[in-house]
Amino acid sequence: SGTTNTVAAYNLTWKSTNFKTILEWEPKPVNQVYTVQISTKSGDWKSKCFYTTDTECDLTDEIVKDVKQTYLARVFSYPAGNVESTGSAGEPLYENSPEFTPYLETNLGQPTIQSFEQVGTKVNVTVEDERTLVRKNGTFLTLRQVFGKDLIYTLYYWKSSSSGKKTAKTNTNEFLIDVDKGENYCFSVQAVIPSRTVNRKSTDSPVECMGQEKGEFRE
């Protein structure tokens, strides 16, 4: 059912990394436009991306209001140039997205090793605490501030001269590891939320090796 010559959106998909959240859908419009609505389970629907010919809508501003809520979005289809027209049910054609809970589902972005510092046979590796678009009291929160101890980092490290990897874990953004004196090491980190059932791990950070500019060496 629905308005003549309009088709319902389909393949509604959430694309979300570190809470930056975009809804995508198909098809590319032909003689129609779209409006998106988003709501928590309260049913207080908010309209976004009015009468757009895009097939994506940035919903970050809405979901960051409460990342632990579960959201649903719906995409309405209207004939181009006649957006007041409705279908036989007295409503425009629409389709619902899957449910989306940002805290449980947003992808963890690729982390970055901020620095590493060697003091004797110990190396302190620091992971950059990326700022998110989640706000509290007008300030943007970091990933650590949002997830707290739910977020851990895994460090992979190995001697530059060999391929055998070791691992370490932390629920802060810092590692303190033992190394062999006189050896150069390479490092990569991964963000992990162990309690999740989906999207548990980020991709690995770029590899950083001792003897390059991010490091500092002290006897």
Partner: antibody
Framework: EVQLLESGGGLVQPGGSLRLSCAAS????????MSWVRQAPGKGLEWVSS????????YYTDSVKGRFTISRDNSKNTLYLQMNSLRAEDTAVYYC???????????WGQGTLVTVSS | DIQMTQSPPSLSASAGDRVTITCRAS??????LAWYQQKPEKAPKSLIY???SLQSGVPSRFSGSGSGTDFTLTISSLQPEDFATYYC?????????FGQGTKLEIK
């Protein structure tokens, strides 16, 4: 555990009024849309009205528009249905239900019987 | 208004049977359909939403399928506690409407 407890039903004469209440517990009340559904004796289910979590959006079935008013007090975790100009055909068990996104009905109260008769 | 038609109106079956109840909408409702179970003198209970999503706590022998206008509720192996009346409901557009119910009785 989600609990919904209706009250306020009873016997009323045609043209009279009743106010039903539904006390909610076990969940964050303001985070959910809520609905009223009724069931006449020996009959099927009929959706009556829904309200969004904020109370800003309300919806009614045609047969009760202008006579019934749905409302909520989020500070008291309570849903209401004010029923005026009652008719014999409004006789039913009235259920309150939690309604995620204002869509389906995932938790129901035990119901309260409203009888409209002279 | 969207009319919802359930069939059959009543059904006799035995424990262990596989049972299918159908629901047809008078116009397309995508997957915006729910199923409920009601036992005598009790409140309805949610079984399925979004045509095929199982409500939390509902046994996996219940399943739903369909999209557009035709939907089914299937009970893979009837248990004694499943004898009840089943209703479908569309939430595509207001006023939301229910099917007339299917009474599942013991054979």
């Amino acid at each position: 555990e989600v609990q919904l407890l209706e009250s306020g039903g009873g016997l009323v004469q045609p043209g009279g009024s009743l106010r039903l209440s539904c006390a909610a517990s076990g969940f964050t009340f303001s985070n959910y849309a809520m609905s009223w559904v009724r069931q006449a004796p020996g009959k099927g289910l009929e959706w009556v009205s829904s309200i969004s979590g904020s109370g800003d959006y309300t919806y009614y079935t045609d047969s009760v528009k202008g006579r019934f008013t749905i409302s909520r007090d989020n500070s008291k975790n309570t849903l209401y249905l004010q029923m005026n100009s009652l008719r014999a055909e409004d006789t039913a068990v009235y259920y309150c239900a939690r309604s995620p996104w204002g869509y389906y009905l995932d938790s129901w109260g035990q119901g309260t019987l409203v009888t409209v008769s002279s | 208004d969207i009319q919802m038609t359930q069939s059959p109106p009543s059904l006799s079956a035995s424990a262990g049977d596989r049972v299918t109840i159908t629901c047809r909408a008078s116009q397309g409702i995508s997957s915006r359909l729910a199923w409920y179970q009601q036992k005598p003198e009790k409140a309805p209970k949610s079984l399925i939403y979004a045509a095929s999503s199982l409500q939390s706590g509902v046994p996996s022998r219940f399943s739903g399928s369909g999209s557009g206008t035709d939907f089914t509720l299937t009970i893979s192996s009837l248990q004694p506690e499943d004898f009840a009346t089943y209703y479908c409901q569309q939430y595509n557009s207001y006023p939301y409407t229910f099917g007339q119910g299917t009474k599942l009785e013991i054979k």
